[in-house]
Structure formats: C-alpha cells, structure tokens
C-alpha cells in the first residue's frame, strides 16, 4: 500500500490563478493502482470537498468546479479508497481565485510539460 502517490493536475492548465466565474477541472490519477480502489476523494485544505466512484478501465478521475469564486482558493489533494483502505494523499495543488480577469499569454517554448503547475506540500 506504500509506493507511488496519486497525482493531481488542473485544466485549463495555463495557470493556477483562476478567474472568478470560470470553470476548472481538477484531475486525479493513479496510473498503477487505480483498479484497486472504487472511490476517489478531492480534499480542500484537508477536508472532503468532492467525492465520487472511480470509473473502471480509466486511470483518471475528473472533478469539475465552477463557476468559481474566492471560496475555492485553497490547497487541493486527491485520495483513493476502497472501504477503509485509503491511499496516501497526492501532493498538494494550490488554487487561487482572483476577481479580475487574467490576460493569459502563451509561454514560449513547448507546452507539454505541466509539472511546474504543481505546488508541493509536506505530504
């Protein structure tokens, strides 16, 4: 039950600064152990935010949030479970919702690497 951690990412993944009123999708994934679990939980600041059944034959589980407001700002992580067997928490992703619209300019260079999006915590 140790080993790899679940992963957490966000789409649209151009920024962790989210404009108020928009929608975001948080994606939890657990590529090598997904089939061991039947529930996935999205936590915000250490408490349950959303929870749902996992989908068989998939390794990713999506949570759509929105339209967002400032109360969505916080630290998010994913946990997989089956009964009382819970995975480790994923690393933590910090989301910030801002009031004004953000003008987003594409970053130069390749855009496939989104690892910079993750804000790592102590977990």
């Amino acid at each position: 039950q140790e080993g790899s951690l679940p992963d957490i990412t966000i789409f649209p993944n151009s920024s962790l600064m989210i404009s108020q009123g928009t929608f975001v999708t948080v994606v939890c994934s657990y590529s090598d152990k997904h089939d061991l679990y039947n529930m996935v939980r999205l936590e915000k600041d250490g408490s349950t935010f959303m929870e749902k059944s996992t989908e068989p034959y998939k390794t990713e589980d999506e949570f759509e949030i929105g339209p967002v407001n400032e109360t969505i700002t916080g630290h998010y992580s994913c946990i997989y479970s089956k009964g009382i067997t819970w995975s480790e928490r994923s690393k933590t992703l910090e989301l910030k919702v801002i009031k004004e619209n953000v003008i987003q300019t594409p970053a130069p260079g390749p855009t496939s690497d989104t690892s910079w999006l993750k804000t790592y915590s102590i977990y």
Epitope: M39, G83, I84, E88, R89
Partner: antibody, heavy 118, light 107 residues
Framework: EVQLVESGGGLVQPGRSLKVSCAAS????????IHWIRQAPTKGLEWVAS????????YFRDSVKGRFTISRDNAKNTLYLQLDSLRSEDTATYYC???????????WGQGVMVTVSS | DIVMTQSPTSMSISVGDRVTMNCKAS??????VDWYQQKTGQSPKLLIS???NRYTGVPDRFTGSGSGTDFTFTINNMQTEDLAVYYC?????????FGGGTKLELK
C-alpha cells in the same frame, strides 16, 4: 496470531492531554493503514482517526481535528494517538483496529478507557 | 457525513428465532456496508463485509443482504451466544460511519 493491544488510558482533566498507544503483532504492520475508533459509555461506535501505512497521510473526524494527532512507529510496530485539549465528550473506550483481509475493520484491540473529568 | 439509521434499536427474542434487523443509509453506499457484533465488555467483531460476505469463521446462520441504501442482517436459529449489540457501518464514503446499534435481549 494478529494482536492489537492498547495502553495509556486513564483519568484526565478537561483541557489536559493524554497519549494512548497500540502495540501490534502477528502481521506486517508497515503494510497496513490503521485506525482509532471510540465508544462513549453505553453509546455506539464512532470512527476517530486513521493513518496510512507509511504514516505520511492522516485523517480525522471533524470534532477532533486540531486536537488529536495520530502517528505510528513502524520499527516498533506501534500506533499512537495524542489527545490534546480534551473535553468531557471525548470520554470513551478507544479501540485501535485494522483491515488486513478485508476493506473493513477485521481486527480490533481490547480497548483503552479515557475519562475526561474534573 | 452519511447517516446510517439502524432499526430496531432493541429486540426481545427467543432461542431458535429468526432475527432480522435493518440499516438505511442516507445516500447510496453501493455494497460497502459491514456488520459487527459486540458482546458486553468485549471489542466489536466483524461478521459480514461488503453487505453479504461472511467473515472467516463466522457461522452460516449469520447472513447479510442489500445494496444502495437499504441493508438487512439476519440471524437464523438464534443462539444464546448471539446475544449482543449489532452495528452496521458504511465504508463507501469518507468518513466511515456506524449505525446506532441493535441490542438483542432474551424474552
């Protein structure tokens, strides 16, 4: 044979602290999540806290968040529950439990009584 | 949190009776309901996991059924050693929650 043995209970005044332990044997302790469940006198069962196999992730019921700390020492096969800022409603028998064969609480300790009273 | 409502809270029974108790979840918990037996002065013991699977060594007079929100636990041919409090618990959704218990007493 799987065994879970709790210790460290007693009488404590409101606002004070106590640390209870659970010594495990008969299984590979470091492979399993482990849990604390409590039962107030003449009342039902209530899940309190859980810790993942490595100890990196911990989970608490809302009423004890910020007051209780769960930890484990895999080298000593021991689980701990630190109870701080104790309240009278924390008075209960505290059981450690784990799920080895099923995703349920299939092994329980004998319980340790914690009484919070002035 | 999911609320597990157990009924009845107590039952007066005789040896040899068929005893049935129920547990209702406040929302769908699939088949993730377990049943525990607790005798006076003892720790709880797992009898049934995931609604209907009898735990190792549990006599076949104990059975469980149900899915979704409604679950049933049955003791066929009640024995004196079955006098206890029985609890259901859901583990489908965090946090795990227990029913209030059903106490079996002799008539």
């Amino acid at each position: 044979e799987v065994q879970l043995v709790e210790s460290g209970g007693g009488l404590v005044q409101p606002g004070r602290s106590l640390k209870v332990s659970c010594a495990a044997s008969g299984f590979t302790f470091s492979n399993y999540g482990i849990h604390w469940i409590r039962q107030a006198p003449t009342k039902g069962l209530e899940w309190v806290a859980s810790i993942s196999p490595s100890g990196r992730s911990t989970y608490f019921r809302d009423s004890v968040k910020g007051r209780f700390t769960i930890s484990r020492d895999n080298a000593k096969n021991t689980l701990y529950l630190q109870l701080d800022s104790l309240r009278s409603e924390d008075t209960a028998t505290y059981y450690c439990a784990t799920g080895i064969n099923y995703s349920s609480f299939d092994y329980w300790g004998q319980g340790v009584m914690v009484t919070v009273s002035s | 949190d999911i609320v597990m409502t157990q009924s009845p809270t107590s039952m007066s029974i005789s040896v040899g009776d068929r005893v049935t108790m129920n547990c209702k979840a406040s929302q769908n918990v699939g088949s993730h309901v377990d049943w525990y037996q607790q005798k006076t002065g003892q720790s709880p013991k797992l009898l049934i996991s995931t609604a209907s699977n009898r735990y190792t060594g549990v006599p076949d007079r104990f059975t469980g059924s149900g899915s979704g929100t409604d679950f049933t636990f049955t003791i066929n041919n009640m024995q004196t050693e079955d006098l206890a409090v029985y609890y259901c618990m859901q583990s489908n959704s965090y946090p795990p929650t227990f029913g209030g218990g059903t106490k079996l007493e002799l008539k």
